[in-house]
Interface confidence: low
C-alpha cells in the first residue's frame, strides 16, 4: 500500500516502561496518511507465568492514561492541557493486551476521530495510574508526507532523529477510534 492510500499500513508500539524508546525524548514513529498506529497496553498473564507475566521495573502491573498533547506538553511531560485518548487500565485482560488504534486520516470519519495533517508532528504522553511506575513515557508521530493540496497547507517538515519506519502488518484485535476522550480541567494557566 503506497503513501496516502485508502488502506494504510499498521504500526505497533508497546506502551510500557520496558520499551526503552518511550523513556527518552525524541522517539518518533513515522506514518503516512491513512496508516494506523496500534498502541498496545501493558499486559500480564493472570497466572503470573509466561511471556508478559512479569511486572514492570517498579513492581506491580503497569497502568497508564494516554494523552494527546502539544509540543510543550510533550517536552515537559505535562498532560494538563492535553486530552485523554485512551486508558490502559486492564493489565490482566484475557487472551491479549488491550489496544488503542489511531488512524491518521486527513478527514475525521468519526464524530470523535481526529484530523491529521501531512508534514506535521503529533505528541503522545502517558501518566501512570500508580506513582510507582515510569513517570514519563512519550512518543512523537510524524505524519508523512508534505503536501500542499489541502487547505493551503505548506508544511516545513524536519524529520527528527530516531525515526522509525512502518512495522510489519499485524492482526486487528479491536479498534477504538471513536472512543470518547475525557478532558482534564485546566487549573491556573492556559498559556502552555
Amino acid at each position: 500500500q503506497g503513501p496516502g492510500g485508502a488502506l494504510g499500513n499498521r504500526h505497533a508500539v508497546y506502551w510500557n516502561s520496558s520499551n526503552q524508546h518511550l523513556r527518552r525524548e525524541g522517539y518518533t514513529v513515522q506514518v503516512n496518511v491513512n496508516d494506523y498506529l496500534d498502541i498496545y497496553c501493558p499486559h500480564y498473564n493472570s497466572s503470573g507465568v509466561g511471556p508478559g507475566a512479569g511486572p514492570g521495573p517498579g513492581g506491580g502491573a503497569e497502568q497508564y492514561v494516554l494523552y494527546m498533547v502539544s509540543r510543550n506538553g510533550y517536552r515537559t511531560c505535562n498532560a494538563s492541557q492535553g486530552f485523554k485518548r485512551w486508558e490502559c487500565n486492564r493489565p490482566h485482560a484475557p487472551h491479549s493486551p488491550i489496544k488503542f488504534s489511531e488512524k491518521f486520516q486527513r478527514y475525521s470519519a468519526f464524530s470523535l476521530g481526529y484530523e491529521f495533517h501531512a508534514g506535521h508532528e503529533y505528541y503522545y504522553i502517558s501518566t501512570p495510574t500508580h506513582n510507582l511506575h515510569w513517570k514519563c513515557l512519550r512518543m512523537k508521530v510524524f505524519v508523512c508526507c508534505a503536501s500542499t493540496s489541502h487547505s493551503g497547507e505548506k508544511p516545513v517538515p524536519t524529520l527528527p532523529q530516531f525515526t522509525m519506519g512502518p512495522n510489519v502488518k499485524i492482526n486487528v484485535l479491536e479498534d477504538f477510534e471513536g472512543e470518547n476522550p475525557q478532558v482534564p480541567k485546566l487549573e491556573k494557566s492556559i498559556s502552555g
Epitope: 494527546m68 498533547v69 502539544s70 509540543r71 510543550n72 506538553g73 492541557q81 492535553g82 486530552f83 478527514y107 475525521s108 464524530s111 470523535l112 476521530g113 481526529y114 484530523e115 491529521f116 495533517h117 508534514g119 506535521h120 503529533y122 505528541y123 489541502h150 487547505s151 493551503g152 497547507e153 505548506k154 508544511p155 516545513v156 517538515p157 524536519t158 478532558v183 492556559i190 498559556s191 502552555g192
Partner: antibody, heavy 121, light 106 residues
C-alpha cells in the same frame, strides 16, 4: 506573560498589498504553537485566515489562499501577514493570535488588540 | 467549510435571568469553543473543549452539546456578561467561527 501586538498601515488602496506585523513578547514563536491571523469584518464576522507554526509551516484558509502569505522573522519574534490584490471587502480589524498547530489540543488563547485596516481609494 | 450558525443574533436579558444561546454546525464536530468579546476589545477565550471554563470565567457560565448542536448558558445574568459571544470549531479545515450572539441587558 504572553503579549501580541499588531501594527498595520491603517489605509490601503484597492489592488495593492496589505501588510500587517505581529510582535510577540513573553513567548518564543519557535518554541511551540501556531501563530494565526484572524480578521473581523465591519459586521463583526470573524474569519480565520491562516497560520505559521513554530516550525515555519503554514496553513491558509481556502477563501484567501491565492492572495495570502504568512512569514516570520524569528530574530525579532515577529510574524507577518501579506494579503495581495485587496478590495474594499478586505476592510477589517486584523488580529494575531496564538493557537493550535494542525489540530493538537490548544485554542486561540492569546490575541493582540487588533489593527483596523481600511481599503479605500 | 463547516458553517456555524448562532442563535439568536441579538438577545436581551434582565439581571438574574437565565440565558441560553445556541450554536449549530452543519457538520458534526468534536468540541466547541466559545469566546467573549466586548466593544473595542479583542475576543477572549471563554469556554474550551465544549464545557470547560477558561481561567477567570465565572462559574455561572456553562457549555454543553455534542455532534452538531452546542449551547452556552449563563445561570444568572450579571451586568458584566453583556457582550458578544462567538462559537468556534477546530475539527475541520478551515477553522470557522459563528456569527455571534450579542447579549444585552434588558
Amino acid at each position: 506573560d504572553v503579549h501580541l501586538q499588531e501594527t498595520g498601515p491603517g489605509l490601503v488602496k484597492p489592488s495593492q498589498s496589505l501588510s500587517v506585523t505581529c510582535t510577540v513578547t513573553g513567548y518564543s514563536i519557535t518554541s511551540d504553537y501556531a501563530w494565526n491571523w484572524i480578521r473581523q469584518f465591519p459586521g463583526n464576522k470573524l474569519e480565520w485566515m491562516g497560520y505559521i507554526s513554530y516550525s515555519g509551516g503554514t496553513r491558509y484558509n481556502p477563501s484567501v489562499k491565492s492572495r495570502i502569505s504568512i512569514t516570520r522573522d524569528t530574530s525579532k519574534n515577529q510574524f507577518f501577514l501579506q494579503l495581495n490584490s485587496v478590495t474594499t471587502e478586505d476592510t477589517a480589524t486584523y488580529y494575531c493570535a496564538r493557537g493550535p498547530y494542525a489540530g493538537y489540543p490548544a485554542w486561540f488563547d492569546y490575541w493582540g488588540p487588533g489593527t483596523l485596516v481600511t481599503v479605500s481609494a | 467549510e463547516n458553517v456555524l450558525t448562532q442563535s439568536p443574533a441579538i438577545m436581551s436579558a434582565s439581571l438574574g435571568e437565565k440565558v441560553t444561546m445556541s450554536c449549530r454546525a452543519n457538520s458534526s464536530i468534536n468540541y466547541m469553543y466559545w469566546y467573549q468579546q466586548k466593544s473595542d476589545a479583542s475576543p477572549k477565550l471563554w469556554i474550551y473543549y465544549t464545557s470547560n471554563l477558561a481561567p477567570g470565567v465565572p462559574a455561572r457560565f456553562s457549555g454543553s452539546g455534542s455532534g452538531n448542536s452546542y449551547s452556552l448558558t449563563i445561570s444568572s445574568m450579571e451586568g458584566e456578561d453583556a457582550a458578544t459571544y462567538y462559537c468556534q470549531q477546530f475539527t475541520s479545515s478551515p477553522w470557522t467561527f459563528g456569527g455571534g450572539t450579542k447579549l444585552e441587558i434588558k
